[in-house]
């Protein structure tokens, strides 16, 4: 006989089973492809000088053998002689030491003896209706199944749940889902309606996230701003890692979670583009501005809770950079140009109001003026800082004004608005007697000392009504008294205060007249 | 999406033959065993032949010796050649891919629409 052929001829050892407790047993045959089968047996005693015969009785009644010598599984193809189509017997005799051994026999149709397989390559998990589904492609040559599926977290054992009977080109499977831990799945299939059937080994783990991606414990810092009018945001605790089930250490697709960065820019709300997303790793560079900060946490199944950050401003002001010259078209501000082809955002709102109420203007594209510059110009009819108050300016510069970080601060400022001049005049001017040749003369704060960095300095200007003398004093900005000496007796005086700004110089109080009178001796 | 498409039915004379063919597309056609079963009017749909593999091939005892079924995996067709045709194989004749017992119906599970092949006395 060929010995790829089941040989019809009586085996070469005599036909005596021992009856012992050792031989063959769990025989196992399978259509392996199209054409091609496979039986598998244990063997339990010693395995030194054994022989296994596979035997084989058709439906006709007429048997035969294939000898697989000390192996314990054997092929063979549909054209070895057994029958695919009909019923077949099989058992394994095993010939040792003198004595036959027998298997249990198995009776079956070859060619629907399938080994089933578990689900392989790609298995697709989605959520439904607060489940979990798990789909595949059903194994070639494999449709109609039972599925069961077995699941644990990092603290708890193996949980076994089926999946129910599956007959099409592709499976699913309802698994439960958790909220807030991970859990490790596997799959395995076996025949539909075949009892008998053994299960298929279990598929490699499917690593699923829990519904809940965990909420980001993670805290900033924001840097001081820099020369280049921008300050960084750094990271100072990581986001907590989700626990695992053993399964799924090292490599477990499936189950990342990524955290996103989500800043939104307050200041500036006339700009194109108010929030931008980055990765959480990308620590980005920002301006002075006021910004909210949230990090998102997603897995596969979507977004779960944000923590949100307050960035306050960057309040420290440059009052020297700024000029502003008032004329009869109206205002201009000058400042040091960045450079070409820059976009400013100017923004103003008064001071000691919500930043809500926060007013801006963005230029057109601008390259500095040959003093090195950048300019901004309004009208006095379009109403910007009109009213007689004090505004916060801050001017930010972008090459980019589309890119949310690609903003920096050119520089944070205080402005008095509408008629300064006017509007910043001392009163409540009173002059009181200090000595024989002198008085302390004191005045209300101007409304230019609420503007921090506007109120240069005061004035105060004596006039001699007899030789029509004058002589002015000034006065730190933050003093509101000042003492004129050298005064004469019975001499008419009149006092005066202006308040003056850098730029602008102010107007005078009304005249206030005194005198010192003539002490007369005893 | 599975697709089974059968062609080659018509009208023949008693004792004439006809090549029936059925090409199938979404799955991999090679590794799946195929059936024909045809059903004449007012009837059930019954057996009529299997290829299991490429080469292992079974039939109803009324086509034995008639019929031959056979495929040609490069193509992903299956055929059906029948010769001496009688008024009593006059039915629509369908092909269908198998997932167990292949002499029932229940064993398959994609069916294509069908040909209608009629043989006139």
């Known amino acids: 006989c060929r010995t790829s052929e089941c040989c019809f001829q009586d085996p070469p050892y005599p036909d005596a089973d021992s009856g012992s407790a050792s031989g063959p047993r769990d025989l196992r045959c399978y259509r392996i492809s199209s054409d091609r089968y496979e039986c598998s047996w244990q063997y339990e005693g010693p395995t030194a000088g054994v022989s296994h015969f596979l035997r084989c009785c058709l439906s006709s009644g007429r048997c035969c053998y294939f000898a697989a010598g000390s192996a314990t599984r054997l092929q063979f193809s549909d054209q070895a002689g057994v029958s695919v189509l009909y019923t077949v017997t099989l058992w394994v005799e095993s010939w040792a030491r003198n004595q036959t051994e027998k298997s249990p026999e198995v009776t079956l149709q070859l060619y629907n003896s399938v080994k089933y397989e578990p689900p392989l390559g790609d298995i697709k998990v989605s959520k439904l209706a607060g489940q979990l589904r798990m789909e595949w492609e059903t194994p070639d040559n494999q449709v109609g199944a039972e599925v069961q599926f077995r699941h644990r977290t990092p603290s708890s054992p193996w949980k076994l749940g089926d999946c129910g009977p599956q007959d099409d080109d592709t499976e699913s499977c309802l698994c439960p889902l958790e909220m807030n831990v991970a859990q490790e799945f596997q799959l395995r299939r076996r025949q539909l309606g075949s009892q008998g059937s053994s299960w298929s080994k279990w598929s490699s783990p499917v690593c699923v996230p829990p519904e809940n991606p965990p909420q980001p414990q993670v805290r900033f810092s924001v840097e001081q701003l820099g020369q280049d009018g921008r300050r960084r945001l750094t990271l100072k605790e990581q986001p907590t890692q989700l626990e695992l089930p053993e399964g799924c250490q090292g490599l477990a697709p499936g189950t990342e979670v990524t955290y996103r960065l989500q800043l939104h820019m307050l200041s500036c709300p006339c700009k194109a583009k108010a929030t931008r997303t980055l990765h959480l790793g990308k620590m980005p560079y920002l301006s002075g501005a006021a910004y909210n900060v949230a990090v998102i946490s997603s897995n596969q199944f979507g977004p779960g809770l944000n923590q949100t950050w307050h960035i306050p401003a960057d309040t420290h002001t440059e009052p020297v950079a700024l000029n502003i010259s008032v004329g009869t078209n109206g205002t201009t501000m000058y400042w040091p140009a960045r450079a070409q082809s820059m976009t400013y955002c100017i923004e103003w709102q008064p001071v000691g109001q919500d930043g809500g109420l926060a007013t801006c203007s963005l230029t057109a594209p601008q390259d500095p003026d040959p003093a090195g510059m950048a300019t901004y110009s309004w009208s006095r009819e379009s109403g910007a800082m009109g009213q007689e108050k004090c505004y916060y300016i801050t001017i930010f510069a972008s090459a980019h004004p589309e890119k949310l970080t690609l903003w920096s601060t050119v520089l944070s400022t205080y402005h008095f608005g509408g008629n300064a001049s006017a509007a910043g005049t001392p009163h409540h001017v009173s002059v009181k007697n200090h000595s024989l040749d002198s008085v302390s003369v004191d005045w209300a704060p101007s409304l230019l000392s609420t503007c921090p960095g506007v109120l240069k300095e005061y004035v105060v200007r004596c006039r001699d009504e007899d030789s029509k003398q004058v002589s002015e004093h000034p006065v730190q900005p933050t003093e509101t008294q000042v003492t004129l000496s050298g005064l004469r007796a019975g001499v008419a005086y009149t006092v005066q205060v202006r308040a003056d700004t850098a730029w602008l110089r102010g107007v005078w109080s009304q005249p206030q007249r005194f005198s010192i009178e003539v002490q007369v001796s005893d | 999406e599975v697709q089974l498409v059968e062609s080659g039915g018509g009208l023949v004379t008693a004792g004439g033959s006809l090549r029936l063919s059925c090409a199938a597309s979404?799955?991999?056609?090679?590794?799946?065993?195929m059936g024909w079963f045809r059903q004449a009017p007012g009837k059930e749909r019954e057996f009529v032949a299997v290829?299991?593999?490429?080469?292992?091939?079974d039939y109803a005892d009324s086509v034995k010796g008639r019929f031959i079924i056979f495929r040609d995996n490069a193509k992903n067709t299956l055929y059906l050649q029948m010769n001496g045709l009688k008024p009593d194989d006059t039915a629509v004749y369908y092909c269908?891919?198998?997932?167990?017992?292949?002499?029932?119906?229940?064993?398959?599970?994609?069916w294509g629409q069908g040909t209608q092949v009629t043989v006139s006395s």
């Open positions: 269908a891919r198998r997932v167990g017992t292949y002499e029932t119906v229940l064993g398959y599970d994609k």
């Open positions: 979404g799955f991999r056609f090679s590794v799946y065993d």
């Open positions: 290829i299991v593999g490429s080469r292992t091939t």
